[in-house]
């Protein structure tokens, strides 16, 4: 299953972790991928390693753990960000999480 | 034993394409990702291009993007590097590498095959 | 891209001695950092991957540290047969690179 914290909220100009917590007793994790809305933002292979969408590569940083940390935060940030498990041989879960970016007091 | 051999290598045109092959055996190929590594004459290493077990994420190096493409027949245990628009920088012995799964080690690799990129 | 800068580019160095070299990358890749061993006219041999694992079969003399942006090769008692080029490669992020190798040569 996947855990997630399904509302966050982060200040413009700031940071925030984008985190989903898979559990499972069985299932490994052969790859991560994390999404705003229909875009790509990242992509994690336990092969290959971390892929960063060419257009987010300066406010992605990868991490913690198998999350994104999203940086200078503006306000079209705000909306669905989605995370997909792909697991073996569990299958495919799927967690979202809605991001508010406010604007700075 | 573990073994790759690569094939395909020659001397070409700049602006033309070579298809380059890499045979696996002695060890479950579908289970694997696998990478494409280069190294100009005289020079030091580079990776070119990687690819998951399932073809499910691939990467390339800058300096091959949009002219490389590397694919993969799990029913065949081949690994194969596409080349189109080939310069002269393209020249160099290229080796198929398999990793330490899931730790990305290269740990077996092929002889190499040498690309030629001359007119 | 993360660049990896290894130094030194080369180093004379006597059967016994203890040689050091160092990779730095541009970004932090947390421990995904692989060291190889390459002859003459030979594939490239996998000392180290994960910073500091030491790959089965390659002698304990040879060892790796480091995380985040700086890692080390060690051969604690050169050899004869380590007189050879050793390059770093980084595994964390796509493209994965390498570094532009370190010649150890005899003195």
């Known amino acids: 299953t996947i855990d997630t914290k399904r509302n966050i909220s982060a200040e413009e100009g700031g940071s925030v972790i984008l985190q989903c917590h898979f559990s499972s007793d069985t299932a490994e994790v052969t790859q991560v991928d994390w999404k705003q809305q229909d875009q790509l933002l990242a992509i994690y292979s336990v092969d290959l390693g971390w892929h960063v969408a060419s257009v987010f590569s300066d406010r992605v940083v990868p991490g913690p753990s198998l999350g994104l940390t999203f940086q200078s935060l503006t306000m079209n940030d705000t909306g669905e960000y989605f995370c997909t498990y792909h697991t073996y041989p569990g299958g495919i879960y799927k967690g979202r999480i809605f991001l508010k970016v406010q604007e700075s007091s | 034993q573990v073994q790759l051999v690569e094939s395909g290598g020659g001397l070409v045109q700049p602006g033309r394409s070579l298809r380059l092959s890499c045979a696996a055996s002695g060890f479950t190929f579908r289970d694997y990702a696998m990478h494409w590594v280069r190294q100009a004459p005289g020079k030091g290493l580079e990776w070119v291009s990687g690819?998951?077990?399932?073809?499910?994420?691939?990467g390339y190096a800058d300096s091959v993007k949009g002219r490389f493409t590397i694919s993969r027949d799990n029913a065949k245990n081949s690994l194969y590097l596409q080349m189109n628009s080939l310069r002269a920088e393209d020249t160099a012995l290229y080796y198929c590498?398999?990793?330490?799964?899931?730790?990305?080690?290269?740990?077996?690799w092929g002889q190499g095959t040498m690309v030629t990129v001359s007119s | 891209d993360i660049q990896l800068t290894q130094s030194p580019s080369s180093v004379s160095a006597s059967v016994g001695d203890r040689v050091t070299i160092t990779c730095r990358a541009s970004?932090?890749?947390?421990?995904?950092l692989a060291w190889y061993q390459q002859k003459p006219g030979k594939a490239p041999k996998l000392l180290i991957y994960g910073a500091s694992s030491l790959q089965s079969g390659v002698p304990s003399r040879f060892s790796g540290s480091g995380s985040g942006t700086d890692f080390t090769l060690t051969i604690s008692s050169l050899q004869p047969e380590d007189f050879a080029t050793y390059y770093c490669?980084?595994?964390?992020?796509?493209?994965?690179?390498f570094g532009g190798g370190t010649k150890v040569e005899i003195k």
């Open positions: 490669q980084q595994a964390f992020y796509l493209p994965w690179t």
């Open positions: 970004q932090g890749i947390s421990s995904w």
């Open positions: 690819i998951t077990w399932n073809s499910g994420l691939i």
């Open positions: 590498a398999k990793p330490v799964p899931r730790l990305r080690g290269l740990d077996v």
